[in-house]
């Protein structure tokens, strides 16, 4: 069963210092991590006992084992169930505590019955503030059953349950009618799922004879010991305030476990601590008393004495629960109560004895589950004792199970029954899983769900390139840490595999399945630096950039440009694909912008050293386009162009460019200003002859303004090569006179 | 599917006996409480016997204690009505109905069987 | 005994308009009411428990109030399978007892 344990203090004088307590004592409680168990849970669980709504109640983690409720304000709101949930996967446990108001009406004799199946459950709840109405049982909140107040028999109303089963497990509640929901009795009925003695699917299995008030479990045949008791069969006891399945944890406060509830996992339930009883826990065991509840007598002999907290002491000479057998028997001494073994190990087991006459190695035999007798290999006769040691053949599932070493010899026999673990070593059921990639590391996270069982002791990372028969490389991790894959070749494909293993001999299960992770590219290491930029238009900027030459061939697949407009916190990125370029034509701009602007050089994903960066200003927008161009060939080296003014200006215009540009040329175009703004026509000189030239023409305000339309001209034939055009403006008036 | 059906009811003479029979089925019949209610012809309802579950308390109208006795056969999912000493006044319909959960009022009746008490 | 008075002995209304009826108690029964509907021929049918709570499958057209000795059933909009005769019941105390009915019947 799981080691989980919820205490309850009951000094319920002052319901703030009530609280509830989780503890676990499961290996790796409550790590939280989604491979290693989720956390603890300890919560009121209003599903069937609802309670006047309230301040939330706080919870705090006392280390990764143990989980307080606090913050109760009123009685009230103790009142109900509440319920711890801990232990992983399969493992999962509920453990419930009901809470009964000590002020109601109707108050439980006993709130927790575990009853084995087909047995008669009677339930009672004495009558401490007398009403006369009907009395309601409830069963999980749903009507079971109605007695007239009439009906109580000493002051306690019964309810028989007959023949129960599994499923009339719950929670049971007798209210009187009229009364408020919290002055109920309330009951927690547990049912075994087998007959009494019995666990194990179909109830086949003989279960191993709890002792001191333990109750075996009816799925796995252990038994579920009392708060101070422990061992294979709950027959040892613990110090004074001490409990769990290994008596590991210690009772809070100056006065131990008075006052404390304490709930385990089904089928035991809920009782006080060794050694104190009452519906507070706060009274002693009555003389030859002992136990959980006080439930035990002692019945000590041979001049044993009664402690309520672990029962018999027995004078020199004497053992047994009530100091019953002689020194004289074999007695088998210091067997672990439990051992734990992984599948397919071959483990050794001891076994020691003492006795008179002194038991000989031939006088210990160790038992399996099924029945096999295993003689022992070798014995260490010592002056005290004889320890008798067993070669276990390989073992397998069906080995799990109580195991019995005997003792035998003139003077009696002894036995001692012990449970043996055989644990599955676990097995990776997912690939590990790639958080991030450089070009020689891979950062992977080996936690996955497995097969097999826990805990798990390390995970083994195993590495080596795709395709390759090269050895594996392995890296050993702690289980609770991202690994990190150092020295791997850029580019490349790794098969990774986990590998798991639990504690002890062979606990190291199989290899999980394959996944391939894949490292980036190299890191780009050329710092590009910007060479120089150009205004094409309010909204268009030229830039160009070089690298430093370096011997071999460029890593690189392209340039990222970024341009930061500081004043609208907007970044702009222009993705330049060729690593060959070396100029870009950065379009769409905003006009009378400040732009902060660098480049970098990239390779896949990765970025290389921005260029230091350039700052640029954008001229705001321009006027709009001049209208009506039209061009006029005077010569074979004139054209003489002709517009009207841009409508809706702006502002006055600070001058004209005119583009002029070889029709089909492969050239960069020619820009001419014409400075005088009021001109509405310019002649073109120095054109070549019988050549075909385009032009178009804008007008700059504070900014170069739009294009116009373009025109298409030709020069008159037969002239001399011109040495390029220049222009000369005049009036249009003036141009039409002459 | 909650079903209650009684029978037993007839022709009776004053100073007579009769056992009114309820069948319960569809629901746990020994968890409840049950009553009988009767209704005379054109009049109101009027509340007559009420059994708790265990059979061992029970309760009457004035105007039928010492006459009526009210049982139950758990077993046999069955409400019993023994009519002693009928008067005219007896005459009506008999339902059997059955409480709510220990409530008080009654979720499920019976179709009724009629009793008529006459010379 | 407790005695429960109903008022008025005849209601006369159309389908669609709204019907109220009320329920005296000779003491005070807390909420520990419940009304009934019955139609010619046919068994008492649970409407209305603790004095305003609606029974399962019952229209929302049928609410009920009030606690201490003084209670009402409000139909709000008559339907034509609404004329009937209704009976309050007291569960406060043994032994049970039942108003003398309200018939509802169509104008």
């Known amino acids: 069963a799981v080691d989980l344990t919820l205490l309850a203090n009951l000094r319920l004088t002052d319901p703030q210092r009530f609280f509830l307590t989780c503890v676990s004592g499961e290996a790796g409680a409550g790590r939280g991590s989604d491979a290693w168990g989720p956390p603890l849970l300890l919560e009121k669980d209003d599903r069937i006992v609802r309670t006047p709504p309230g301040p939330p109640l706080r919870l705090a983690r006392n280390g990764s084992h143990q989980v307080t409720l606090r913050g109760f304000s009123k009685p009230s709101d103790l009142v109900g169930v509440f319920s711890c949930v801990g232990g992983a996967g399969a493992r999962r446990t509920r453990v419930i505590y009901v809470h009964n108001s000590p002020g109601a009406h109707l108050l439980p004799d006993k709130v927790t019955h575990t009853v084995n199946k087909g047995d008669t459950a009677v339930l009672s709840a004495r009558v401490h503030k007398e009403k006369q109405t009907d009395v309601i049982w409830k069963s999980n909140g749903s009507y079971f059953y109605t007695l007239d107040w009439h009906e109580a028999q000493d002051g306690r109303f019964l309810l028989q349950l007959p023949n129960v089963q599994p499923p009339s497990s719950g929670i049971y509640s007798a209210t009187y009618l009229e009364a408020s929901p919290l002055g109920s009795a309330f009951f927690r009925l547990i049912v075994r799922g087998c007959g009494a003695g019995r666990w194990g699917p179909g109830c086949t299995k003989e279960c191993p004879g709890c002792l001191h008030g333990g109750v075996c479990h009816d799925h796995d045949g252990e038994c579920v010991c009392p708060p101070g008791f422990t061992g294979t069969r709950c027959e040892q006891a613990c110090r004074e305030g001490r409990f769990g399945q290994s008596c590991q944890e210690q009772c809070p406060g100056i006065s131990g476990c008075r006052g404390l509830t304490f709930c385990l996992p089904d089928p035991y339930g809920c009782s006080c601590g060794s050694g104190w009883r009452g519906s507070q826990c706060q009274e002693a065991c009555a003389p030859g008393h002992f136990g959980a509840d006080c439930r035990l007598q002692c019945q000590c002999q041979n001049g044993g004495t009664c402690d309520r907290f672990s029962g018999c002491v027995c004078p020199s000479g004497w053992h047994g629960v009530h100091c019953e057998k002689s020194d004289r028997i074999p007695q088998i001494l210091n067997m672990a109560s439990e051992l734990e073994f992984n599948l397919e190990t071959m483990p050794r087991i001891n076994c020691a004895a003492a006795g008179n006459p002194f038991p000989v190695r031939g006088s210990i035999e160790l038992r399996k589950p099924d029945g096999t007798v295993l003689l022992s290999t070798k014995a260490i006769v010592e002056p005290e004792k004889t320890t008798a040691e067993f070669e276990v053949p390989r073992l397998v599932l069906a080995d799990s199970g109580f195991w019995e070493c005997r003792v035998s010899t003139s003077g009696g026999q002894d036995s001692r029954r012990f449970k043996v673990n055989v644990k599955v070593p676990p097995v990776p059921l997912a690939a590990p899983r790639l958080l991030t990639k450089q070009s020689r590391q891979l950062v992977v996270s080996p936690l996955v769900s497995f097969s097999g069982d826990g805990p798990i002791s390390t995970v083994r990372l195993h590495y080596r390139p795709q395709d390759s028969t090269m050895d594996w490389s392995t890296i050993v991790v702690d289980p609770s840490e991202n690994v990190t894959l150092m020295n791997l070749r850029p580019k490349t494909g790794y098969s990774v595999r986990v590998q798991l293993s639990r504690p002890g001999e062979g606990g190291e299960g199989a290899w999980g399945p394959p996944t391939l992770m894949t490292t980036d590219c190299p890191e780009p290491l050329l710092q590009p630096w910007l060479e120089g930029w150009h205004v094409e238009g309010t909204d268009r900027l030229r830039v160009s950039w070089s690298l430093p030459l370096v011997p071999g061939p460029l890593v690189g697949d392209g340039f990222l440009l970024r341009l930061w407009d500081g004043t609208r916190g907007q970044e702009r990125r222009e993705n330049v694909s060729s690593p060959q370029a070396r100029t870009a034509l950065l379009t769409g701009l905003t006009p009378g912008t400040h732009y902060q602007l660098d480049v970098q050089l990239y390779h896949c994903t990765l970025l290389g050293p921005a260029s230091p960066p350039a700052h640029v200003l954008l001229p705001p927008s321009g006027p709009p386009a001049p209208r009506h161009l039209h061009a006029q060939a005077l010569s074979d080296s004139e054209i003489q162009l002709t517009w009207k003014h841009p409508e809706a200006l702006p502002g006055p215009i600070s001058k004209y460019v005119v583009e002029v540009q070889v029709a089909g040329g492969a050239g960069d175009p020619l820009w001419i200003d014409v400075d005088r703004p009021e001109e509405t026509s310019t002649i073109i000189r120095g054109l070549n002859a019988s050549t075909r030239y385009l032009f178009r023409m804008r007008a700059s305000i504070q900014g170069l303004g739009d294009w116009s339309n373009t025109v298409e001209e030709s020069t008159l034939g037969n002239g001399l090569q011109a040495e390029g055009p220049v222009q000369e403006s005049r009036a249009a008036e003036e141009g039409l006179d002459q | 599917e909650v079903q209650l059906l009684e029978s037993g009811g007839g022709l009776v003479q004053p100073g007579g006996s009769l056992r009114l029979s309820c069948a319960a089925s569809g629901f746990t019949f020994s968890k409840y409480k049950m009553h009988w209610v009767r209704q005379a012809p054109g009049k109101g309802l009027e509340w007559v016997s009420v059994i708790y579950p265990s059979g061992g308390k029970t309760y009457y109208a004035d105007s039928v204690k010492g006459r009526f006795t009210i049982s139950r056969d758990n077993s046999k999912n069955t409400l019993y009505l023994q009519m002693n000493s009928l008067r005219a006044e007896d005459t009506a319909v008999y339902y059997c109905a059955r409480e709510m959960g220990g409530s008080g009022w009654y979720d499920y009746w019976g179709q009724g069987t009629l009793v008529t008490v006459s010379s | 005994n407790i005695q429960m008075t109903q008022s008025p002995a005849t209601l006369s209304l159309s389908p669609g308009e709204r019907a109220t009826l009320s329920c005296r108690a000779s003491?005070?029964?807390?909420?520990?009411l419940a009304w009934y509907q019955q139609k010619p021929g046919q068994v008492p049918r649970l409407l209305i428990y603790d004095a305003s709570n609606r029974a399962t499958g019952i229209p929302a057209r049928f609410s009920g109030s009030g606690s201490g000795t003084d209670f009402t059933l409000t139909i709000s909009r008559l339907e034509p399978e609404d004329f009937a005769v209704y009976y309050c019941?007291?569960?406060?105390?043994?032994?049970?007892?039942f108003g003398q009915g309200t018939k509802v019947e169509i104008k």
């Open positions: 019941q007291q569960y406060g105390s043994l032994p049970r007892t």
């Open positions: 003491q005070s029964i807390s909420s520990y």
